[in-house]
């Protein structure tokens, strides 16, 4: 058993049929010594008496709010949550496996630049009685500070018969050095509580590996005289790290016909312009990637040829 926060405790249970559970000692937070009784949740049944009480916790019916009383007055509360371990593996019932980039990916994180700011998100089908708490650091043995905000519901989607809820959180490394080579990874830890179930999820990464630039901005076409060719130009996204001479991007320019089956023409360039042939009803798209490190491509910025 360990304390999650004041008066909230997590009991770690091996979860199998007829498991004996854990014996937990509760202590009433009071200077009183005598006449103390205990109840669980809203039950009027008295569980026992004394300043300390030893209880057996083996299932969710044993979790909940334990309250000590004296003469009708509430003295203190202890909320017990359960963390299930089945066949040696902690349960992951609350969050959905996103399966990207690999199985058992519950947290996904991205950064728009090297400033030390990043966003993580996760999915669940649970809509109520759900709370999240996020902590982060760089390294784990001698952790350096990373400050995370509160997790918020960022999207709702219908997936077949189910509603899916996306939560996200923004974090900022306290003393980020954008140009430095990272040697210790960022660690992100999410505590999830659904009703009386506790679970925790972790992710470990280098900022360089989660970089995904915003799409190029100000995408424009300039027709070239007496030609089917156009000059496409764009700019670095505002959110990308500066100076651009050091934090450089490379670009992919794509000409895509109206039909997905039509052949795509692609050009790769380090410049912020390119000359391509603009077919009727086609569109031109440009995306960006860190020039020196193969992290994710940005989403596409697009303009119609016409």
């Amino acid at each position: 058993i360990w304390e999650l926060k004041k008066d909230v405790y997590v009991v770690e249970l091996d979860w199998y049929p007829d498991a004996p559970g854990e014996m937990v000692v509760l202590t009433c937070d009071t200077p009183e010594e005598d006449g103390i009784t205990w109840t669980l949740d809203q039950s009027s049944e008295v569980l026992g008496s004394g300043k300390t009480l030893t209880i057996q916790v083996k299932e969710f019916g044993d979790a909940g709010q334990y309250t000590c009383h004296k003469g009708g007055e509430v003295l203190s509360h202890s909320l017990l949550l359960l963390h299930k371990k089945e066949d040696g593996i902690w349960s992951t019932d609350i969050l959905k496996d996103q399966k990207e980039p690999k199985n058992k990916t519950f947290l996904r994180c991205e950064a728009k630049n090297y400033s030390g700011r990043f966003t993580c998100w996760w999915l669940t089908t649970i809509s109520t009685d759900l709370t999240f708490s996020v902590k982060s650091s760089r390294g784990s043995s001698d952790p350096q500070g990373v400050t995370c905000g509160a997790a918020t519901l960022s999207a709702e989607r219908v997936r077949g018969d189910n509603k899916e809820y996306e939560y996200s959180v923004e974090c900022q490394e306290d003393s980020a050095c954008p140009a430095a080579e990272e040697s210790l990874p960022i660690e992100v830890m999410v505590d999830a509580v659904h009703k009386l179930k506790y679970e925790n999820y972790t992710s470990s990464f280098f900022i360089r590996d989660i970089i995904k630039p915003d799409p190029p901005k100000n995408l424009q076409l300039k027709p070239l005289k007496n030609s089917r060719q156009v000059e496409v130009s764009w700019e670095y996204p505002d959110t990308w790290s500066t100076p651009h001479s050091y934090f450089s991007l490379t670009f992919c320019v794509q000409v895509q016909g109206k039909s997905k089956r039509e052949k795509k023409d692609r050009v790769f360039t380090d410049k912020t312009s390119a000359t391509v042939i603009c077919r009727k009803n086609a569109s031109i798209s440009v995306r960006a990637q860190d020039r020196y490190y193969s992290s994710s491509w940005s989403e596409w910025a697009s303009v119609p040829c016409s």
């Epitope: 559970g21 009784t37 049944e45 008295v46 569980l47 026992g48 008496s49 209880i55 057996q56 916790v57 083996k58 299932e59 019916g61 044993d62």
Partner: nanobody
Framework: EVQLVESGGGLVQPGGSLRLSCAAS????????MYWVRQAPGKGLEWVST???????AYADFVKGRFTFSKDNAKNTLYLQMNSLKPEDTALYYC????????RGQGTQVTVSS
């Protein structure tokens, strides 16, 4: 009509063990909270242990891992396994349907003495 019949008490040396039983009838035993309480000579009733419908238990501080409360729903019987007995455990032990011991059997005497 609720009936509770305790048995299994006796004289035992310090450090010894006893297993008390309580046969219950006249009520839906399996979904009731049940209790063991005791009364030492010249003292009031004292709560010892509770068992919930799911079989989970709670114990008074003085028990300190020495006693185990269990039940057999098929036999409508409660058990209190008492190990490492001490002279201060000497008392009349009752099983009860309520914490206050207002509905209880006739009790079974446990005496711990050398």
């Amino acid at each position: 009509e609720v009936q509770l019949v305790e048995s299994g008490g006796g004289l035992v040396q310090p450090g010894g063990s006893l297993r008390l039983s309580c046969a219950a009838s006249g009520f839906a035993f399996s979904n009731r909270w049940m209790y063991w309480v005791r009364q030492a000579p010249g003292k009031g009733l004292e709560w010892v242990s509770t068992i919930k419908p799911n079989g989970s238990t709670a114990y008074a501080d003085f028990v300190k891992g020495r006693f185990t409360f269990s039940k057999d729903n098929a036999k409508n019987t409660l058990y209190l396994q008492m190990n490492s007995l001490k002279p201060e455990d000497t008392a009349l032990y009752y099983c009860s349907t309520d914490y206050a011991g207002t509905v209880r059997g006739q009790g079974t005497q446990v005496t711990v003495s050398s």
